[in-house]
């Protein structure tokens, strides 16, 4: 990971919610589900109602970074995806409202969102060389790449 001090002076200001109620599927077509309260995992679902629906909020960097910086929230909740360390599960953090400004250690709530065709990648702002990833028989975690799966398809407007 990048040294944390490199990031600590950058300030991120909330702009707006840019996507509502979408599902994330990994490259194996597994959907992200909420398991055991504060964890996420991936599973092949017969019923997409069991998949987590996410909202995505956009932030603007004081560094005027060209990257799109986002926060991920479970729709209709106050639970936000929070990065830990490499190979550690991402957690769901409860907050009363979406943070208006994020800086320092709070950047574990933020991800750089990159798209390449239909593939979507979410890199941790706190750990810029680690991605949100799925891993066989494990939780959704932060990983640098294979064998973890780091590319996702966004499914929008699921009934």
């Amino acid at each position: 990971s990048a040294p944390f001090s490199f990031l600590s002076n950058v300030k991120y200001n909330f702009m707006r919610i840019i996507k509502y109620e979408f599902i994330l599927n990994d490259a194996l077509n597994q959907s992200i589900i909420r398991a055991n309260d504060q964890y996420l995992t991936a599973a092949a679902l017969h019923n997409l109602d069991e998949a987590v629906k996410f909202d995505m909020g956009a932030y603007k960097s004081s560094k005027d970074d060209a990257k799109i910086t986002v926060i991920l929230r479970i729709s209709k909740t106050q639970l936000y995806v929070t990065a830990q360390d490499e190979d550690q599960p991402v957690l769901l953090k409860e907050m009363p409202e979406i943070p208006k400004t994020i800086t320092g250690s709070e950047t574990n709530l933020l991800f750089f969102w990159e798209t390449h065709g239909t593939k979507n990648y979410f890199t941790s702002v706190a750990h810029p060389n680690l991605f949100i990833a799925t891993k066989q028989d494990y939780w959704v975690c932060l990983a640098g790449g294979p064998p973890s799966i780091t590319d996702f398809q966004i499914l929008e407007n699921q009934a």
């Epitope: 589900i33 909420r34 398991a35 055991n36 309260d37 964890y39 995992t41 599973a43 109602d49 069991e50 998949a51 987590v52 629906k53 996410f54 479970i74 729709s75 209709k76 909740t77 639970l79 028989d137």
Partner: antibody
Framework: EVQLVQSGAEVKKPGVSVKVSCKAS????????MHWVRQAPGQGLEWMGW????????TYADDFQGRVTFTLDTSTSTAYMELSSLRSEDTAVYFC???????????????WGQGTTVTVSS | DIQMTQSPSSLSASVGDRVTITCRAS??????LNWYQQKPGKTPKLLIY???RLHSGVPSRFSGSGSGTDYTFTISSLQPEDIATYFC?????????FGQGTKLEIK
């Protein structure tokens, strides 16, 4: 096929404890929380609490706090509920139930054990 | 804690009737409302989740609606096999309270 199989009926004297087991099969045990719900004769469903099958942490309903303990044996995919200081009002059917989140926000119990009858009588 | 108030506590209806049960939460539960069916001597069974979504294998005569604090469960045409007690349950936040139940009988 998801199955929750509970231990058999128990008859206990007041003041002692009872331990009910719930063996899960057909899914990854540590992915979904396990809940315990009881039903006194002719009464409704009473949520007792749940156990996080990954961390082992439990949350108990206020009415059972201090008297109930949930435990796990992940090697056999089994959850346990122990209720102590039994009294006649604890005579009930005890169910285990697997929890699931729909959309990541709405919680339901979509698979249930067959129930274990516990009778407390002197 | 969120309290769930279910009504009526019992009702009697004829085969083919439309049957309605209501459930009121003590605060907004954002559609996180489930309905269960329990036949005599059997285990409870999830029928409807998230207010209106039918669990797999549940007949389409069962339906649910509502929002905020007020929710309704309907059987469009009562069948003899629907004799059971029905419970609502909020799935918004711990503790996951159930309603008191509605015992449904055939006239």
């Amino acid at each position: 096929e998801v199955q929750l199989v509970q231990s058999g009926a128990e008859v206990k004297k007041p003041g002692v404890s009872v331990k009910v087991s719930c063996k899960a099969s057909g899914y990854t045990f540590t992915t979904y929380g396990m809940h315990w719900v009881r039903q006194a004769p002719g009464q409704g469903l009473e949520w007792m609490g749940w156990i996080n099958t990954y961390t082992g942490e439990s949350t108990y309903a206020d009415d059972f706090q201090g008297r109930v303990t949930f435990t796990l044996d992940t090697s056999t995919s089994t959850a346990y509920m122990e209720l102590s200081s039994l009294r006649s009002e604890d005579t009930a059917v005890y169910f285990c139930a697997r929890g699931i989140y729909y959309y990541g926000s709405s919680y339901a119990m979509n698979y249930w054990g067959q129930g274990t009858t516990v009778t407390v009588s002197s | 804690d969120i309290q769930m108030t279910q009504s009526p506590s019992s009702l009697s209806a004829s085969v083919g009737d439309r049957v309605t049960i209501t459930c009121r939460a003590s605060q907004d539960i954002s559609n996180c409302l489930n309905w269960y069916q329990q036949k005599p001597g059997k285990t409870p069974k999830l029928l409807i989740y998230y207010t209106s979504r039918l669990h797999s294998g549940v007949p389409s005569r069962f339906s649910g609606s509502g929002s905020g604090t007020d929710y309704t469960f309907t059987i469009s045409s009562l069948q003899p096999e629907d004799i059971a007690t029905y419970f609502c349950q909020q799935g918004k936040t711990l503790p996951y309270a159930f309603g008191q139940g509605t015992k449904l009988e055939i006239k």
